[in-house]
């Protein structure tokens, strides 16, 4: 077909203008309101009803095909008749203090049923009793500090940690490795209360009774804990619960800072190792174990009665068939399930996806289809371990690895209202920079300026002068399976806070009952201009990926990134110069492969400039080289101990799932290497990981060479 038929004789830029112009802030606001009327916990009737509603609306909007895709996965819920709580007990075993069983409902929501009380999803049942040890953020380095420097053992203790800095699943894993028999997670005002801002409902700060829910799994990309690697459908073989992937082995429970005050105020033992362990409560932050002085006979007891259950979940998958390359898929996906009302997470994202679908649908109704197929997804059970997206990708992995061009994630659109935040593959850097130059900034003081201008001023790149910061992809969201397992180029964008002045972890009301529609309308984005901007960024990314004749991927940006990552890991290794020499560790091969990749990428770009775009075969060949470049970084064997993290350049940090690590295989081999008992074995593993990275970069470079 001649290409103009695909777009109804409208130019690419004209069609893009029309698409962007169709996006309306008022619609996003309306959709957000609609999606936040009731809780939408995964596996509940409410969330199934919302799935059906979205299915019907996407059909109305004009998508060619909309389907519900269901799976039966392991979920976790609190026991309604046997609530979870923590108590302080005296020497006679009497409870002298109990933590609250629920959060006070926000104004206007007093009569809403089905608000799940705060809990740590997938915590096992148990009633451990013992002395408390305060472990700061429960990071790897916090336990090193405790055990190695302060000589404090957590073995047989109940540990209490403040949320923030790292993914809560990593906190629990660290506590388990330290021998703890239970874990309490709490939100400290230092991390969830910004000075001079009022608590909800008068402001956007966390009140003392507010609590962060969340799963405490360590799935490492496995998806449903009972069906790792395969879709959890009716034919699936399911592991016994004892062999499930990533479940914690100790009871875990979250509390707010009012309750934490009571647990921490009489802590004994030494003072914290340094002032970075002190939070914002009026307590000494003594480490323990146990209480001080007259309180030393008191103990802490956890009462956890949550249960796991195989439960049906529902993704909504919408298809807009491509006019010219229907076998090439650009995916826009975000989750629908929420812990409670989901005012920000996820519905500020779901509302944006809804409006993007509506705009693409409007174009299609006018006869203007995208060049490539666009798949839209409303994922379920993201909060329970990225289950909906992972199961769907497992089911369709063969199609995705052959046809997947890109995945754009669409969880929360806002976590602040200061500036843009983007994490993506280097392949998308220039795409993002270019499209933000064409969009208006919504920021005060930047009227008439581009989004790129405000973004680069407020969030400058630490490496490249005059450019905005783009971060590495980590995990903790639905792009994980697409990027880390399948090697599909991925990206995400949202509006964020000012990290320089606002030290809080995430936004204060994250995963609490107070994350409501009113929170967004009153305090974050009254006019929905930031939501609209995020819709434009996400929408424009999808539009360009689906409509550009040549895929808007820049392999030279990947070359620059690889050079930086090689330098970084080399510098880490060079902190051990004697061992490097003794065990003959060399990075020469890796640097050589990176140089080769750089050379090949440069030549590829030259050929791309000279490409005859009217020749569909030559065009498809080069587009395929671009599409498959991300795939080339996938190692079928995966990373050590993490078979579903297969990307050799990027993986979620082993110490914080949310953060991305570059050359993760080498990084993990080097981590804490000086304390390894068998130094020779440890450095041998470093050598092996360097060779894997070298081979992978070299092999990826080869895919960019002229095909014959």
């Amino acid at each position: 077909k001649p290409s103009n038929e695909a777009t109804g004789n409208v130019s690419h830029s004209g069609m893009k203008k029309e698409f962007l112009h169709e996006l309306k802030a008022e619609n996003i606001k309306k959709f957000l309101y609609n999606f936040t009327r009731t809780p939408h916990l995964a596996g509940t009737q409410n969330n199934f009803e919302l799935a059906k509603q979205i299915h019907d609306q996407w059909k109305e909007f004009g998508l060619d095909l909309v389907e519900l895709s269901h799976y039966d996965v392991l979920l976790s819920y609190p026991n309604k008749t046997h609530p979870n709580y923590i108590s302080i007990i005296n020497e006679d075993g009497n409870e002298i203090f109990k933590t609250s069983l629920s959060e006070q409902p926000p104004p206007g929501y007093e009569n809403i049923s089905d608000v799940v009380p705060p809990y740590s999803a997938f915590s096992p049942q148990g009633t451990p009793e013992g002395d408390l040890v305060y472990v700061n953020y429960a990071r790897t380095e916090d336990f090193f500090k405790l055990e190695r420097e302060m000589k404090i053992s957590c073995s047989g203790k109940i540990v209490i940690a403040r949320y923030g800095k790292v993914f809560r699943g990593n906190m629990v894993k660290n506590a388990q490795l330290a021998g703890a028999k239970g874990m309490i997670l709490y939100s400290d005002p230092a991390d969830y209360f910004v000075p001079a801002v009022k608590s909800y409902p008068d402001g956007w700060n966390l009140p003392g009774g507010g609590v962060q829910r969340g799963n405490v799994l360590n799935l490492n990309g496995a998806g449903d804990p009972l069906t790792p690697g395969y879709p959890a459908n009716e034919h699936a073989y399911r592991h016994e619960l004892t062999n499930a992937v990533g479940l914690p082995s100790i009871p875990v429970h979250p509390i707010g800072y009012d309750d934490a005050q009571k647990l921490l105020e009489h802590m004994g033992g030494p003072a914290p190792p340094d002032s970075s362990w002190k939070g914002g409560l009026k307590v000494p932050y003594n480490v323990g174990p146990g209480f001080a002085g007259n309180f030393s006979t008191q103990k802490v007891k956890m009462h956890i009665h949550s249960y796991t259950k195989v439960t049906r979940i529902y993704n909504v998958i919408g298809t807009l068939k491509g006019a010219l390359e229907p076998d090439r898929y650009v995916i826009l996906g975000g989750h629908r399930d929420a812990w409670v009302f989901g005012g920000i997470d996820p519905q500020s994202g779901a509302a944006v996806v809804h409006e993007i679908v509506r705009s693409f649908g409007t174009l299609k109704k006018k006869g203007r289809r995208p060049r490539r197929t666009i798949l839209f997804a409303s994922w379920d059970a993201e909060e329970f371990g990225l289950l909906g997206s992972t199961e769907w990708a497992e089911e369709h992995s063969r199609l995705l690895q052959e046809r997947g061009v890109a995945y754009i994630n669409a969880d929360s659109s806002i976590e602040g209202n200061y500036t843009l935040r983007v994490d993506c593959t280097p392949l998308m850097y220039s795409l993002v920079y270019n499209l933000t130059k064409e969009l208006q900034s919504p920021d005060e003081g930047f009227e008439g300026k581009s989004l790129y201008d405000s973004w680069k001023e407020k969030s400058p790149s630490p490496e490249f002068i005059g450019m905005p910061r783009i971060s590495k992809l980590g995990s903790g969201n639905d792009f994980e399976v697409f990027f880390q397992r399948l090697g599909i180029a991925s990206g995400r964008a949202r509006y964020t806070k000012n990290w320089k002045t606002n030290k809080v972890s995430s936004y204060p009301l994250y995963h609490s009952v107070y994350e409501t529609y009113e929170l967004v309308v009153k305090f974050y984005d009254p006019t929905f201009k930031y939501h609209l901007t995020v819709a434009q960024v996400r929408g424009a990314m999808v539009f360009e990926l689906a409509n550009s004749i040549v895929l808007p991927f820049d392999c030279q940006s990947y070359a620059v990134a690889l050079k930086k990552y090689a330098d970084t890991i080399y510098n880490i290794s060079m902190k051990h110069p004697q061992e490097m020499k003794a065990y003959m560790i060399s990075f020469d091969s890796l640097f050589s492969a990176v140089n080769n990749f750089t050379d090949v990428a440069s030549k590829f770009n030259q050929r791309l400039q000279e490409l005859d775009k009217s020749n569909p075969i030559l065009l498809r060949i080069m587009n395929d080289q671009l599409m498959y470049l991300e795939r080339a970084f996938i190692d079928p064997l995966g990373l050590p101990g993490r078979p579903f993290y297969r990307h050799i350049i990027y993986a979620p940090s082993s110490h914080n799932k949310y953060a991305g690590e570059s050359f993760p295989g080498i990084y993990d081999a080097l981590f804490d290497i000086s304390s390894k008992v068998n130094a020779s074995k440890a450095w041998n593993e470093v050598k092996r990981q360097i060779s894997i990275a070298t081979f992978t970069v070299q092999a990826a470079a080869e895919t960019l060479r002229e095909v014959a």
């Epitope: 420097e149 302060m150 000589k151 404090i152 004994g268 033992g269 030494p270 003072a271 914290p272 190792p273 340094d274 002032s275 000494p284 932050y285 003594n286 480490v287 001080a292 002085g293």
Partner: antibody, heavy 123, light 108 residues
């Protein structure tokens, strides 16, 4: 009444290890909940906190001295020792044994001081 | 590290006069600040902790104020035994605990 008494060599040669002992009378390390530390004073640098220790074995060191410093406590002898390796003329100072205000107030102000001992590093 | 800056470096006053000594922290130390007095040949002595609380046995003429980064030690009516060197110290942010350079209060 609690008293602190520093003891150690007045003169130390460069590059050797300085060892000082603080003897505490009138209070038990392990039952008191107090933190015990060392401070030094030079005409040039003024008062400088060296480090602090708790009876549990937890130590808190000045980062500028951490690589050379070890604090130890012998609860049976009621003694608290400082070891500073590879000393130079820069380490010449009056060394004070101190107690942090307390009990159970952590690394707070210093409410009790020994009379101090002059250490000179010279060949 | 939190730097503590004391001013003035020296101050000459007569007995009976009021002395005002300042201490500035390079970042907020909340009210975790102490004041000490040191006389020649002696160890320092704790006067004030928590920015404004007098230590045991310290006369009422000594008072401390301030929070965050700006602190003041006032001696309402100077006695002959008050002429000494005064140091401030923060214990909010550590390691290290840090002291000011001192203010020498001399008899005029």
């Amino acid at each position: 009444q609690v008293q602190l008494q520093e003891s150690g060599p007045g003169l130390v040669k460069p590059s050797v290890t300085l060892s000082l002992t603080c003897t505490v009378s009138g209070a038990s390390f392990s039952s008191s909940g107090y933190y015990w530390g060392w401070i030094r004073q030079t005409p040039g640098k003024g008062l400088e906190w060296i480090g602090t220790m708790f009876y549990s074995g937890a130590t808190y060191y000045n980062p500028s001295l951490k690589s050379r410093l070890t604090l130890n406590m012998d609860t049976s002898k009621q003694e608290f020792t400082l070891r500073l390796t590879s000393v130079t003329a820069e380490d010449s100072a009056v060394y004070y044994c101190v107690r942090h205000r307390g009990p159970d107030t952590g690394l707070d102000a210093f409410d009790l001081w020994g009379q101090g001992t002059q250490v000179t590093v010279s060949s | 590290d939190v730097e503590m800056t004391q001013s003035p470096a020296s101050l000459s006053l007569s007995p009976g006069e009021r002395a005002t000594l300042s201490c500035r922290a390079s970042q907020s130390v909340s009210s975790d600040l102490a004041w000490y007095q040191q006389k020649p040949g002696q160890a320092p002595r704790l006067l004030i902790y928590g920015a404004s609380t007098r230590a045991t046995g310290i006369p009422a003429r000594f008072s401390g104020s301030g929070s965050g980064t700006e602190f003041t030690l006032a001696i309402s009516s100077l006695q002959s035994e008050d002429f000494a060197v005064y140091y401030c110290q923060q214990y909010n942010n550590w390691p290290p605990l840090t002291f000011g350079g001192g203010t020498k209060l001399e008899i005029k």
